[in-house]
Amino acid sequence: EPPTACREKQYLINSQCCSLCQPGQKLVSDCTEFTETECLPCGESEFLDTWNRETRCHQHKYCDPNLGLRVQQKGTSETDTICTCEEGLHCTSESCESCVPHRSCLPGFGVKQIATGVSDTICEPCPVGFFSNVSSAFEKCRPWTSCETKDLVVQQAGTNKTDVVCGPQDRQRA
């Protein structure tokens, strides 16, 4: 009686269980009663990443430099190429099909996490006691200057965008 289900690494065709091709190889011909499944390796710029019965391999992804992309990991016959973005850019999606420039943190905000090829800059508001007076993709919030340690006094309070202004202490008249 012909099988209705096949074991792992097999597929059902013409009432018969045939062996699947291993990752990295494509189907050339199905098995018969007398012959095994025939498979051949994918070409130089192709891959198949699963046990399969595909008659064509998939093309490796192209990391287009015009879109700011570069190769992070070269593809093999079993894996696709992995793209990442050039310096100063990050991917717009998980599949990394194009890149955009990293966001800068505006004055009053500092960099919480520097951007990578796959993630954008994460900014955070400068808390009390810290400031950022520049628009930057790298700079963290900096602490206000401590006037006391310089034997000075605060002449102008700091904000999240400006440092405190220190000045000399008023000498008390005799």
């Epitope: 690494k9 062996s19 990295g24 012959t35 025939e38 498979c39 079993e78």
Partner: antibody, heavy 121, light 107 residues
Framework: QVQLVESGGGLVKPGGSLRLSCAAS????????MSWIRQAPGKGLEWVSY????????YYADSVKGRFTISRDNAKNSLYLQMNGLRAEDTAVYYC??????????????WGQGTLVTVSS | SYELTQPPSVSVSPGQTASITCSGE??????ICWYQQKPGQSPVLVIY???KRPSGIPERFSGSNSGITATLTISGTQAMDEADYYC?????????FGGGTKLTVLG
């Protein structure tokens, strides 16, 4: 019974050339993918090259790429290995073998007796 | 380049079960063949596609493959099974052999 017989081995100087032949009998040669495998004295098996039924798909080991050429003549039931630029490390017994199916689903189910190639000055 | 690693030698008493391993990265993602080679002879295919036996190969030869290890098992080992055993797989567009394991049947 199914038979593969290699010939053409011998002593050759480094940089020299040799052409190995493998004569197939008692099976339909054109139905099978074929390989050359070698074994250095006292060492393990090393795959050399692979050719499809029609000869349109060919693979080589990195160690012989650009120096060795595999070919076949289905009308003569013969497999060949042209070896140029021979080096001392090519010294080995060379086997031709039949693959029971294309690619990884197969296995080399019939081997010749081997022919010895010695590269020495 | 891809490598298959085998123990250089395995010993077994007659009638016992011999297990020869072959390990490699993502090996379970490949089909494995096993060859037997006796001194002065050409190799003989004993297992292909992980577990299939060509005609004429005794039932005491069996194979399995999972994860990073493939195993050739010879149950009820006989003196005539003493030989070198090689695993083999395809990787990309090349065929790769393991370094071989010498099986010694004691006694």
């Amino acid at each position: 019974q199914v038979q593969l017989v290699e010939s053409g081995g011998g002593l050759v100087k480094p940089g020299g050339s040799l052409r190995l032949s493998c004569a197939a009998s008692e099976f339909t040669f054109s139905d099978y993918y074929m390989s050359w495998i070698r074994q250095a004295p006292g060492k393990g098996l090393e795959w050399v090259s692979y050719i499809s039924r029609s000869g349109d798909t060919i693979y080589y080991a990195d160690s012989v790429k650009g120096r060795f050429t595999i070919s076949r003549d289905n009308a003569k039931n013969s497999l060949y290995l042209q070896m140029n630029g021979l080096r001392a490390e090519d010294t080995a017994v060379y086997y031709c073998a039949r693959d029971l199916a294309a690619g990884a689903t197969g296995g080399l189910d019939c081997w010749g007796q081997g022919t010895l190639v010695t590269v020495s000055s | 380049s891809y490598e298959l690693t085998q123990p250089p030698s395995v010993s077994v008493s007659p009638g016992q079960t011999a297990s020869i391993t072959c390990s490699g990265e993502r090996l379970g993602n490949k089909y494995i063949c096993w060859y037997q080679q006796k001194p002065g002879q050409s190799p003989v295919l004993v297992i292909y596609q992980d577990f299939k036996r060509p005609s004429g190969i005794p039932e005491r030869f069996s194979g399995s493959n999972s994860g990073i290890t493939a195993t050739l098992t010879i149950s009820g080992t006989q003196a005539m099974d003493e030989a070198d055993y090689y695993c083999q797989a395809w990787d990309s567009r090349t065929v790769v052999f393991g370094g071989g394991t010498k099986l010694t049947v004691l006694g």
